[in-house]
């Protein structure tokens, strides 16, 4: 009796996977064994697939064989038993191109109020993802194990931390990553839970600013009790989207260790130019708090988003305000090279009633004032880019009276 | 599959000096804490410090802080624990452990151990 | 230093029997706790970590709870190789530290 080819062969690629799994053409033939041959693109020969020989299974696994993932490749199987079936060609196929990313890897760290998802490729240095292993990004679906009220969270890199959760409870999540580059969506990580911690007697930090002062830049945070210590750690912002790089680790700043302050002043020769990531513990020599949310700094905008220089033209109902370049130590003016916003706020100097202008211009009209009386202003710079969301600190207020009627043309 | 493997057993007389070495492999050697935990004869653990192999970092158990040097060789995956001024009290195991990532915004548990070498300090 | 507990100090008991051990440290640890089992000439093995998660490759059987200054390891039915002495171990701040260790003992 002639044997039958196998029919409907699939090839299944997933990271560094290859399997192959096919269906018997005819069940009543027993002890059939199968065989694969694989040809590249340009070749005429066909070659043994090893790992893929005398299969007794409908499925084999030819991840051994090195490939150029990003070049054709072409199968053929038959059925073999005394004699062998006819060859049945499989579509020619790119791995690159057919290729799922597997579940990553996933670690989780608890807080009381907030959990530390650690991300890495399932397939540690990958030949699938080698030249894309810095483009992943990952989402993750997160939810109550008590609930299960799923909430997603969108293009996250390799660390990623969720706040506002609530103390001693269980969240589920899972994670799965995506190559944009290649309009490729992994398969989900298995779920994995953890429970937060009960409640720290010791909240992080909150609030943290920097601002420059002369040569230094001062580091501010809140905190709620007293007589405590404090030390700042930081990190290049380029590495939370590569943990795997020996370089990411959190260092201490050596001016900010141990500090028994809300504040601490270092030099801004500590960084070179970039943008880095900051955070705060706090300790009152027992216990040790969680680390404050990370602030993103960077020193460009940082060492010059002073607050602006402004001079003010006195009319009976306006003021003309015109913003100048602010002043750095030595009075030379500071050269902007980046959009900004002004938040001009101004006042009758007998009240508190505060009044807000935001413009992109550096002329601005403030209007509908009284004759003859004193209002005060003050105002700050805000960089329009979102994602370095950074504000000067205001200006000192600036106080002016207004003429007397009639002098506004 | 990730081995910590441990130098030979050591005799040291009081006051001498012993240097212990953990030679790892199997995973990424720099990404890693590495720990050591001694035990003396029949009695429980205790932690000693910890290096971090791709800078030197390096922490200590107040208590042995003058005493202990944690050094290492990148070139061999190799972690080393020199103790001086030994004196008897010092007998026991010493062990090197890996510890957490170093990229963990926490500390971890120590997931892997040497076997182990007996160091004895007798005159 | 953050002390921690351990009880009992020894336990007998029979294969098949739940056991449990319970460790207790002076400050709030965060579930910064690891359980390890240690045989005699041997280094000692992880079982879990984190007070709650199972290393891989440890039987089920092993279960650790528990949270702020109170935790435990339940043996749910004891096995001959089970037989050994369990530490519990801190690492929520420097110097970490352990317990005395629990010796579990054929009755």
């Known amino acids: 009796k002639n044997l039958k080819s196998p029919q409907k062969v699939e090839v299944d690629i997933i990271d560094d996977n290859f399997i192959l799994r096919w269906n018997r053409s005819d069940e009543s033939v027993g002890n059939v064994t199968f065989s694969f041959d694989y040809q590249k693109t340009g070749m005429d020969n066909w070659i043994k697939l090893s790992g893929c020989q005398n299969i007794t299974s409908t499925k084999c696994n030819f991840s051994s064989l090195k490939l150029n993932v990003y070049e054709e490749i072409k199968l053929r199987i038959r059925a073999e038993k005394e004699n062998t079936s006819s060859w049945y060609e499989v579509d020619s196929f790119t791995p690159f191109r057919k290729a799922q990313i597997g579940p990553p890897e996933v670690h989780l760290e608890a807080e009381d109020k907030a959990i530390v998802i650690h991300i890495s490729p399932g397939t540690k240095d990958s030949v699938m993802w080698a030249l894309d292993g810095l483009s992943f990004t990952y989402s993750l679906v997160i939810w109550k194990n008590s609930s299960g009220v799923e909430e997603r969270i969108e293009n996250i890199y390799s660390r990623h931390k969720i706040y506002k959760l609530s103390p001693e409870t269980t969240y589920c999540l899972k994670v799965k990553a995506a190559l944009l580059t290649s309009w490729k969506i992994g398969v989900y990580s298995p779920v994995h839970c953890i429970k937060t911690t009960v409640e720290n007697e010791l909240p992080p930090p909150e609030n943290i600013e920097v601002s420059v002062q002369n040569q230094n830049y001062v580091l501010k945070w809140d905190y709620t009790y007293a007589n405590m210590t404090f030390q700042v750690q930081w990190l290049h912002a380029f590495l939370k989207r590569n943990p795997g790089n020996h370089l990411y680790k959190w260092k201490q700043i050596p001016d900010c260790e141990n500090v028994k302050t809300t504040q601490c002043v270092f030099p801004q020769n500590v960084f070179q130019k970039g943008i880095y990531l900051l955070r705060v513990q706090a300790s009152d020599g027992n216990n040790t708090s969680f680390w404050s949310e990370e602030i993103k700094f960077d020193t460009e905008i940082q060492a010059f988003l002073l607050p602006p220089v402004f001079n003010i033209r006195s009319l009976s109902d306006s003021f003309h305000i015109y913003i100048g370049a602010p002043k750095q130590s030595g009075n030379t003016p500071v050269i902007q090279d980046y959009p900004l916003i002004y938040e001009i706020i101004f006042w009758e100097n007998t009240s508190n009633a505060e009044r807000k202008i935001i413009e992109k211009k550096t002329d601005v009209t403030v209007p509908n004032l009284k004759p003859l009386t004193v209002y005060c202003v003050k105002a700050r710079a805000h960089t329009m880019d979102e994602k370095l969301n950074k504000s000067s600190v205001f200006s000192d207020a600036v106080c002016e009276k207004t003429k007397p009627g009639n002098t506004s043309k | 599959q990730v081995q910590l493997v441990q130098s030979g057993a050591e005799v040291k007389k009081p006051g001498a000096s012993v240097k212990v070495s953990c030679k790892a492999s199997?995973?990424?050697?720099?990404?890693?804490?590495m720990n050591w935990v001694r035990q003396a004869p029949g009695q429980g653990l205790e932690w000693m410090g910890k290096i971090d192999p791709s800078d030197s970092e390096t922490h200590f158990n107040q208590k042995f802080r003058d005493r202990v040097t944690l050094t290492v060789d990148k070139s061999t995956s190799t972690v080393y624990m020199e103790l001086s001024s030994l004196r008897s009290e010092d007998t026991a195991v010493y062990y090197c452990?890996?510890?957490?990532?170093?990229?963990?915004?926490?500390?971890?548990?120590?997931?892997?151990w040497g076997q182990g070498t007996l160091v004895t300090v007798s005159s | 230093d953050i002390q921690m507990t351990q009880s009992p100090s020894s336990l007998s008991a029979s294969v098949g029997d739940r056991v449990t051990i319970t460790c207790k440290s002076s400050?709030?640890?965060?579930?910064?706790l690891a359980w390890y089992q240690q045989k005699p000439g041997k280094a000692p093995k992880l079982l879990i970590y984190g007070a709650t998660s199972l290393e891989t490759g440890v039987p089920s059987r092993f279960s650790g709870s528990g949270s702020g200054k109170d935790y435990t390891l339940t043996i749910s039915s004891l096995q001959p190789e089970d037989f050994a002495t369990y530490y519990c171990q801190q690492y929520w701040n420097k110097p970490f530290t352990f317990g005395q260790g629990t010796k579990l003992e054929i009755k």
């Open positions: 452990a890996r510890g957490g990532r170093i990229s963990f915004d926490y500390d971890a548990a120590l997931d892997y």
């Open positions: 199997g995973y990424t050697f720099t990404s890693y804490w």
């Open positions: 400050e709030v640890i965060y579930n910064r």
